[in-house]
Structures are given as structure tokens and as C-alpha cells.
């Protein structure tokens, strides 16, 4: 399987987008990463705080036979009914070895605010 060369650089290949809409809107934020070895759990942050009860799903697929091959990971955070409390800056966070990596931010806002 194709393997990325590893360096002390963010494993994120995809960052959350921006969502702006009316109250009640449904939307999805996504993070995508490619890592070597066991895939990490992806945590979601809103305004720098971990979302403990996030409605997120994580898909991870090995790209080779060996568990030390690359894995692709996609985490999707679903916002089911947009409220004022959902607005803010969203990022993904992963712990890889002794390092913490945070994605670039995406923003969720309410129309008219």
C-alpha cells in the first residue's frame, strides 16, 4: 500500500469546513487524516474545549496488510439542529505517540448573527 513518509508534521489531510445557516439546520463537519500504525481516536474541540458528548462517527481503513501500514481515518461530527450553543470554532485533535496534533479550524455560525 502507498505509504506517506513520516515527519513531525500534522497528519491531517482534511480540516473542518464552515457552516453558516438558520436555526434547525443539519450539517456535518469532517476531519481526515492518514497515519502510519494504529489509528488514533479523533477528538472534537469547540472553542478549544473537548466535546465530550459529540455526535461523531469515525471511519478507519487500513491501507495494507500490516498493522504498521498507513491507515486513513475520517471523523464526521454531525450537527443535527443548529442552535446558538453550537456556534464557534471547531477543530479535531489527535494524540500520536508523544505529540498532540490539532487540525486547522472550521467555523459554525447562525445566519443573521
Amino acid at each position: 500500500a502507498p505509504r506517506g513518509t513520516q515527519a513531525e508534521e500534522s497528519p491531517f489531510v482534511g480540516n473542518p469546513g464552515n457552516i453558516t445557516g438558520a436555526r434547525g439546520l443539519t450539517g456535518t463537519l469532517r476531519c481526515q487524516l492518514q497515519v502510519q500504525g494504529e489509528p488514533p481516536e479523533v477528538h472534537w474541540l469547540r472553542d478549544g474545549q473537548i466535546l465530550e458528548l459529540a455526535d461523531s462517527t469515525q471511519t478507519q481503513v487500513p491501507l495494507g496488510e500490516d498493522e504498521q501500514d498507513d491507515w486513513i481515518v475520517v471523523s464526521q461530527l454531525r450537527i443535527t439542529s443548529l442552535q446558538l450553543s453550537d456556534t464557534g470554532q471547531y477543530q479535531c485533535l489527535v494524540f500520536l505517540g508523544h505529540q498532540t496534533f490539532v487540525s486547522q479550524p472550521g467555523y459554525v455560525g447562525l445566519e443573521g448573527l
Partner: antibody, heavy 120, light 107 residues
Framework: EVNLVESGGGVVKPGASLKLSCEAS????????MSWVRQTSDKRLEWVAS????????YYLDNVKGRFIISRENAKNTLYLQMSSLKSEDTALFYC?????????????WGQGSSVTVSS | VIVMTQSHKFMSTSVGDRVSITCKAS??????VAWYQQKPGQSPKLLIY???TRHTGVPDRFTGSGSGTDYSLTISNVQTEDLAFYYC?????????FGAGTKLELK
Amino acid sequence: EVNLVESGGGVVKPGASLKLSCEASGFTFSNYGMSWVRQTSDKRLEWVASISGGGGRTYYLDNVKGRFIISRENAKNTLYLQMSSLKSEDTALFYCARGARASYFAMDYWGQGSSVTVSS
Amino acid sequence: VIVMTQSHKFMSTSVGDRVSITCKASQDVTTAVAWYQQKPGQSPKLLIYWASTRHTGVPDRFTGSGSGTDYSLTISNVQTEDLAFYYCQQHFTTPLTFGAGTKLELK
């Protein structure tokens, strides 16, 4: 305005080497993953290689691995593709493309392409 | 390797019509599908990514949808400037792969 300009293409014999360059402007180059994609005469698009914003992670199509090297010089806003041991099947129009912020494996802006012909 | 299959090499349409171009992935790509438009003598242009997110400046007559392995690009109220090649691509994982393309032409 995002602008990508490829150069370095040409006509070479099988086994030869060629280095493509892509000069980028209109955006913060180091913040974006970049890719090379080629298009053959039958209009098919084929991804060749990608590189992360800082250059530390590279990804290759299997049949160019060991022959092609993708690299970047962020201080010069330039992406490169060093091609060696060229084969006739490498003949194509090579595009430089910027990776989208939401997934740099999707390409949001493309250059006009640089033609590579490998023929004896 | 994920194979992207566009079953129609050509699709015929009329100005003002609605047309859907389909693409099937050989495995689940979790909505990581992009669509590109290419006109003769031009480079490809991104229309849609993550299956349904429109790229900046793309008219809202272009709509992407799908999940799992089945994806489609719908053009409503087709305009003459929409006559072009359309390619799907999975951006789930390397090697990144494209469909063979669908040429949209006038009836």
C-alpha cells in the same frame, strides 16, 4: 487570485530524466498540500503524487514510486516533480494542483499543464 | 486501489434540462468524492467535494449527492456553457483515483 504555472516539460527518450516546476501565487503556499495529476491522450486523469504543506509527508502512485520525487520549496512558492527512468507510458500533460483545505486529496485549483512526451 | 466507475461515457441533454451523472466506487469512500468539470483546451475545475459541498463560485444548479459507494452530480437547468467532460474522484485515500469521465453533449 490563485495561480499555478507549470514549466519544464518537453520531449525526451525512454530512460531520460526531466524536472517539472510549478510556481504558485495568490495564496499562502506552505498552508496547502499540493499534487501532480497527469492526463493522457485518451482524456483520462491519473493522480501521480501529493505532498503536505510542510513537505514532510509524500504520497505516490505505485508505478512512479522510486522513479519520481515530489518536493517543494516553500520559500520560493514552488512545487517540483523530478522524473527519472521515464517510460513511453509516462507521456501525458502534467498538471500541478492545489489541495483543498477541507481535504488536500481533492484539488481546488489547477495549472494549465506541462506536456511530457517520452518517445524513442 | 479504489476504482471509480462512470458508466456513461456520453450523456445527451438539452438546454434547460436536468441531468444526473453517476459514479460508483468499488468500496465505501465515506462521501469523500469530488467532481470536476473540464472544457476543451482547459484544465479541470473543481465543482464539488465531500460529495455535496460546492466549491467557491460554483453555480447552485450543480448539486452533488450520494454516500457509501454511489454518487451523482446533478445539473439542473443545463446551460450551453455546461457542455463539457465531468470526472468524479475519490479523495478518501491514496492512490487517489478518477472516473474515466462523462461527456455532456447536446441532443
